[in-house]
């Protein structure tokens, strides 16, 4: 899994008038990390683990960056011509990634009223637009605005790419939290399914980093993919992750089945409780 930093900003307009505030969230490695507190006009860490990433450093840089990006996005929304009556939203999602081979990715996506209409690979400057005519119109509108001051735009987007990666590297380098290894807690439960069958569920929780293998085995051999159900690997709000895998087995054959877990080079097997 690459390390990633994801900015999610939203600005609103009402009856064609762009509202003064903005909403902002930042995710680090898929975990809620920062949000913009509109009352205090400050970037705030999301939970203890986020505070631990920067230790005792202030969040002034993050506050400044989010404020600037919110201002830019409000200006962009003001230039969208087809705003009708009522409430409308413009959302910008920016993601930068550092992969294991040290290669980087950086992308930017614009949504109007929740619909994607423009994406950019920031490193290569390639823009992509969905096929719908509404998306094409919106994209042309926004790109024309961004092109009005080509030099500013060029500088802005390359700086944005560099800044995102620079911030991500800063968090990775300064943080013991992001280099830690937290082994999962594994718990196996059983529940009655239909007559003669039971559903066995294996849950792994509170692990970091995100990469994990969790699978059911019968007599030491992994079951086929289509006989198992997997949950997504989701953040649990504490800077760690959780997931699960379930399968249906015949009652009385529990002893033949084990849950196999592999995480950060360690592995373990877990029996079905009788």
């Amino acid at each position: 899994e690459p390390h990633s930093l994801r900015y999610n900003l939203t600005v609103l307009s009402w009856d064609g008038s762009v509202q003064s505030g903005f909403l902002a969230e930042v995710h680090l490695d898929g975990q809620p990390f920062l949000r913009y507190d509109r009352q205090k006009c400050r970037a705030k860490p999301q939970g203890q683990w986020a505070e631990d990433v920067l230790g005792n450093k202030t969040w002034d840089r993050e506050t400044r960056d989010l404020t600037g990006n919110g201002k830019d996005l409000r200006m962009t929304l003001a230039h969208i011509k087809d705003q009708k009556e009522g409430l409308h939203s413009l959302q910008e999602i920016r993601v930068c990634e550092i992969h294991e081979d040290n290669s980087t990715r950086s992308s930017q996506h614009f949504y109007y009223d929740g619909e994607l209409f423009l994406s950019q690979n920031v490193e290569t400057e390639e823009w992509t637009v969905p096929q719908s005519s509404r998306a094409q119109t919106l994209a042309m509108n926004v790109r024309n605005f961004l092109k009005e001051d080509a030099m500013k735009t060029k500088t802005h987007y390359h700086a944005m790419h560099a800044d995102c990666l620079q911030e991500l590297r800063r968090y990775l380098e300064s943080s013991v939290v992001l280099r830690r290894r937290v082994p999962p807690m594994v718990n196996v439960t059983r529940s009655e399914a239909s007559e003669g069958n039971i559903t066995v569920t294996c849950r792994a929780s509170s692990f970091y980093p995100r990469n994990i293998t969790l699978t059911w085995r019968q007599d030491g051999v992994s079951l086929s993919h289509d006989t198992q159900q997997w949950g997504d690997v989701l953040p649990d709000g504490n800077g760690t992750y959780q997931t699960w895998v379930a399968t249906r087995i015949c009652q009385g054959e529990e002893q033949r089945f084990t849950c196999y877990m592999e995480h950060s080079g360690n592995h373990s097997t877990h029996p079905v409780p009788s």
Partner: antibody, heavy 115, light 108 residues
């Protein structure tokens, strides 16, 4: 109809600078897209060399970075390649191409590096 | 840089047969930045399939593409004699853009 046409000398001496120009018709190079140089040594595969984008940004293949310059002349709707300190290994067919998924190509020009 | 490896290096099939060409990347690629090209002897390459699965203008429907992440496939459902060419995959996710080494398609 978008067309790209490479031009430049077919023979360059070792240690000299290779210079090629791509003339674009049917589309403005400042409107959109990346404008690329790609080469193919005899009997070998394709190598992306670099591009100048619609905004004027240049990106180069790190394997050539110290020797390559791509520039553009917006008034003539042209972009150019300069490759310095050439050797026999730079002998190839040189193509200019539009885009990121290269949708339009020039027909290619053969450049031989030889004394 | 992302290295693309094509397989097989050479494919020799009869007219009407199905051809499957593979391209594997050393790092994950976004499917919208993955493309296939066809190059016939003495000609410039031409875009065949863009963004993994979209047919370029003028390309017959017997060509199709699929894939995601690190593994991509070009399929020709029923080979025609004019399909003799070298086929290249290419990624535009990161700089430098890179091509596979090519698969040479021959007709028996």
């Amino acid at each position: 109809q978008v067309q790209l046409q490479e031009s430049g000398p077919g023979l360059v001496k070792p240690s000299e600078t290779l210079s090629l120009t791509c003339t674009v018709s049917g589309y403005s190079i400042t409107s959109d897209y990346a404008w690329n140089w790609i080469r193919q040594p005899p009997g070998k595969g394709l190598e992306w060399m670099g591009f100048v984008s619609y905004s004027g940004t240049t990106k180069y293949n790190p394997s050539l970075k110290s020797r390559i310059t791509i520039s553009r002349d917006t008034s003539e709707n042209q972009f150019s390649l300069k490759l310095s300190s050439v050797t026999a290994a730079d002998t190839a067919v040189y193509y200019c191409a539009r885009g990121y998924g290269f949708d339009y190509w020039g027909q290619g020009t053969t450049v031989t590096v030889s004394s | 840089e992302i290295v693309l490896t094509q397989s097989p290096a050479t494919l020799s099939l009869s007219p009407g047969e199905r051809a499957t060409l593979s391209c594997s990347a050393t790092s994950s690629i976004s499917s919208i930045y993955f493309h296939w090209y066809q190059q016939k002897p003495g000609q410039a390459p031409r875009l065949l399939i863009y963004r993994t699965s979209n047919l370029a203008s003028g390309i017959p429907a017997r060509f199709s593409g699929s894939g995601s992440g690190t593994d991509y496939t070009l399929t020709i459902s029923s080979l025609e004699p004019e399909d003799v060419a070298v086929y290249y995959c290419q990624q535009g996710t990161t700089i430098p853009f890179t091509f596979g080494q090519g698969t040479k398609l021959e007709i028996k």
